[in-house]
Interface confidence: low
């Protein structure tokens, strides 16, 4: 930000009424009135270029320092070219000297050169040559010097002419302040610029109304430089929850809008399924029946639990059931739907029911399912099963009601036995099988049916209580179709699939395990 100048002395603005002291009195410097753009202007002028050694002083009035530490002196002046005078005016100069003196009181007309300290020799960038002067072209020079630190109550400036043709049109003395500033929603007070060039005064800012330093952020600070410019901003303030930045201030969110945390972002419109918010809202309340999960951002619409799975089927396959369902028609506005499957079994004879999680096996864990199907196995035959599929989402835990669909299935058969060929010879086949342990207690006997492949007219049956059998008196090098079926008190269980097993040829005789 640009420095603010506080003017202590302005000759040009004073309209010739400052009454500066000239020394020697009545010689050298003289106050002249002129007209510029039809306005009277005043200047202190001296032009004793032909008179040999000159030592003409012009002293300002006493200037009260106030709070200034370093002052800046801006001079506007013209200097005529010494060559524009007859014979080049051998004693003519083209510079003058600038002095200052500090004091705690006004000495009035008591002028003492020895009290003054030289600031600098002032030389023009451009001199007014004859042709310019005759044509009334002005060559206005602007020079600035600074002095500091000042410590007394006030000071004088003085101009020493040593034989130049000079007109002082403007003498302006000022000090600099870093102006009051609003930056980064922080207010920095007007601050007097320091006097030492390398130093930067650190100034703490205060957050504007309804602004805060963000958590973990730095407090706002700026540095006021000697030239009155603010430099090196550190930290910032952000509009607090419920407020947004409008120009250099924090303004409450309008009704129907909200902001849930201190940030640079603007207020957001209340999302779907929320009630209209009041002014300055930090969040928008959910409509009745709609909820916000703890981890849901305030910008997300309010949601509700899903409806039940739309369509549920249970397809029995022996001692297995495949459950399939479609997603709920109403997701509740969320995508985090999961499914839970629970199982209940009922004995047909007694009508007694109970949970069956412990006795069945699921193809994947039945809680937190994301897929829409699961296979349940190890079901007992001649048992009624009821499966419940519940749909849940991130807000289901906020309500007591549940969204589920059920499907029932009766298991009438045992699961088909899994059959293996244990060994073979030219005239025999050794076969074994297995069924799930829960079903084994219900099996009375196993029936093994076998026949030659391609012979549909005759087949053989063997019954056994065990889990294996050797089929003898078979023809060598012949393929037999073998099927095993469990027999229960209620009737036949599911048959295994038909397996093709081949006896050995005479050349490859001897028992061979497969």
């Amino acid at each position: 930000a640009q420095g603010k100048e506080v003017v202590l002395l302005d000759f040009a603005a004073a309209g010739g009424e400052l009454g500066w002291l000239t020394h020697p009195y009545g010689k050298g410097w003289d106050l002249m009135q002129n007209i510029m753009n039809d306005m009277p202007i005043y200047m202190y002028s001296v032009c004793n270029v032909m008179s040999g050694d000159q030592d003409n002083w012009l002293r300002t009035n006493w200037v009260y320092r106030g709070e200034a530490e370093r002052i800046f002196i801006e001079l506007k002046f013209t200097v005529r070219d010494c060559n524009s005078f007859p014979g080049g005016a051998s004693s003519c100069k083209e510079t003058f000297n600038l002095y200052y003196a500090e004091s705690d009181l006004d000495y009035g007309t008591n002028f003492q050169k020895r009290l003054f300290t030289k600031i600098d020799t002032i030389a023009p960038d451009e001199i007014t040559v004859s042709s310019d002067f005759e044509a009334r072209h002005v060559k206005l020079n602007v020079e600035e010097r600074s002095v500091g630190p000042l410590t007394r109550k006030g000071f004088y400036l003085a101009f020493q002419d040593i034989g130049a043709c000079v007109a002082l049109l403007s003498v302006r003395v000022y000090y600099k302040k870093c102006p009051e500033l609003l930056q980064g929603l922080a207010h920095f007070p007007e601050t007097i610029a320091g006097s030492d060039a390398p130093s930067l005064a650190t100034v703490a800012g205060t957050c504007v109304d309804h602004a805060v330093v963000p958590p973990g952020g730095e407090e706002p600070r700026m540095h006021c430089a000697v030239d009155g410019e603010w430099l090196v901003p550190i930290g910032q303030c952000l509009c607090q929850a419920g407020y947004e930045k409008v120009e250099d201030a924090c303004q409450a969110c309008s009704p129907g809008f909200f902001k849930f945390e201190a940030s640079e972002s603007p207020c957001l419109e209340c999302p779907e399924h929320t009630l209209p918010s009041p002014e300055g809202a930090t969040s928008c309340e959910c409509e009745e029946g709609f909820f916000r999960a703890p981890q849901d951002p305030a910008s997300m619409p309010c949601t509700r639990p899903p409806s039940a799975p739309h369509y549920l089927t249970a397809v029995g396959m022996g001692a297995k059931v495949e459950l399939r369902w479609t997603p709920p028609q109403d997701s509740g506005g969320r995508e985090d739907i999961v499914y839970s499957v629970t199982c209940e079994q009922c004995w047909p004879e007694s009508g007694e029911c109970g949970p069956c999680e412990a006795s069945v096996r699921y193809s994947e864990p039945p809680h937190g399912l994301t897929r829409t199907s699961v296979t349940v196995s190890d079901l007992e035959p001649h048992m009624n099963y009821t499966f419940t599929v519940e749909a849940r989402n991130g807000v289901s835990g906020l309500v007591t009601s549940r969204s589920f669909r059920t499907a029932s299935v009766s298991i009438n058969q045992t699961e088909p036995p899994k059959v293996r060929l244990e060994g073979r010879s030219t005239t025999s086949l050794s076969v074994s099988w297995s069924i799930p342990p829960p079903q084994q207690s219900r099996v009375w006997k196993y029936e093994v049916t076998y026949r030659k492949k391609g012979d549909s007219n005759s087949y053989n049956v063997r019954r056994t209580e065990g889990f294996s059998v050797t089929l003898d008196d078979l023809a060598p090098d012949t393929t037999y179709l073998v099927q095993v079926q469990a027999l229960t008190q209620e009737g036949q269980g599911a048959g295994s699939k038909v397996h093709e097993f081949q006896t050995l040829s005479p050349e490859g005789s001897g028992n061979l395990a497969v």
């Epitope: 510029m36 202007i41 013209t78 072209h137 002005v138 043709c165 049109l169």
Partner: antibody, heavy 128, light 107 residues
Framework: EVQLLESGGGLVQPGGSLRLSCAAS????????MAWVRQAPGKGLEWVSR????????HYADSVKGRFTISRDNSKNTLYLQMNSLRAEDTAVYYC?????????????????????WGQGTLVTVSS | DIQMTQSPSSLSASVGDRVTITCRAS??????LAWYQQKPGKAPKLLIY???NLHTGVPSRFSGSGSGTEFTLTISGLQPDDFATYYC?????????FGQGTKVEIK
């Protein structure tokens, strides 16, 4: 060659209005301050008004203040004087005059506000 | 306003004469003074500015002097073309007032 040519004069009744024009040529009009100077029959010269090179500032003699308005159109190299509420004592030959605009500041010298160039004049007669 | 007073108001002179016209200001005007020549039915012409500076094209027989409140216009050798009315004008103040004029006639 510098030329200033006034027009718009004539006979007008007291309380009436006239607009004088001054067409300039032969110099850079926009660099010059311009003025109107009048001369009543058989009398001396009286400065009336002036205008800066770019249209401001403007100044008026006390005798015409509030009634006369000076203006210029640099694109047309023309100076104007709008005269309202005319009185018998406004009867005069009105001269358009031009003078070098000078510069912002002149050290120990005055502004060049004398009249270097004059028009031939236009007669304004205010009579009932 | 600054008042400008010329004297004499008229004078008679012969060709070749040296003629001096005086102009007094009611207050100091430094050297901000111009002289004009006007012939009957014609516009004024600038002769001298800044009290003593001859305007371009003006014959050197015309000269001006003075500062503060007293100024003079001198015609060192009157020529037939010089019979006219002469006006002084100050340009230190806004109003740029003119003197009442001095008429130079043939004797």
């Amino acid at each position: 060659e510098v030329q200033l040519l006034e027009s718009g004069g004539g006979l007008v009744q007291p309380g009436g209005s006239l607009r004088l024009s001054c067409a300039a040529s032969g110099f850079t009009f926009s660099h010059y301050m311009m003025a109107w100077v009048r001369q009543a029959p058989g009398k001396g010269l009286e400065w009336v008004s002036r205008i800066g090179p770019s249209g401001g500032p403007t100044h008026y003699a006390d005798s015409v203040k509030g009634r006369f308005t000076i203006s210029r159109d640099n694109s047309k190299n023309t100076l104007y004087l709008q005269m309202n509420s005319l009185r018998a004592e406004d009867t005069a030959v009105y001269y358009c005059a031009g003078y070098d605009s000078g510069y912002d500041y002149v050290a120990v010298a005055g502004p060049a506000e004398y009249f270097q160039h004059w028009g031939q004049g236009t007669l304004v007669t205010v009579s009932s | 306003d600054i008042q400008m007073t010329q004297s004499p108001s008229s004078l008679s002179a012969s060709v070749g004469d040296r003629v001096t016209i005086t102009c007094r200001a009611s207050q100091s005007i430094s050297t901000w003074l111009a002289w004009y020549q006007q012939k009957p039915g014609k516009a004024p012409k600038l002769l001298i500015y800044k009290a003593s500076n001859l305007h371009t094209g003006v014959p050197s027989r015309f000269s001006g002097s003075g500062s503060g409140t007293e100024f003079t216009l001198t015609i060192s050798g009157l020529q037939p073309d010089d019979f006219a009315t002469y006006y002084c004008q100050q340009y230190q103040s806004y109003s740029r007032t003119f003197g009442q004029g001095t008429k130079v006639e043939i004797k």
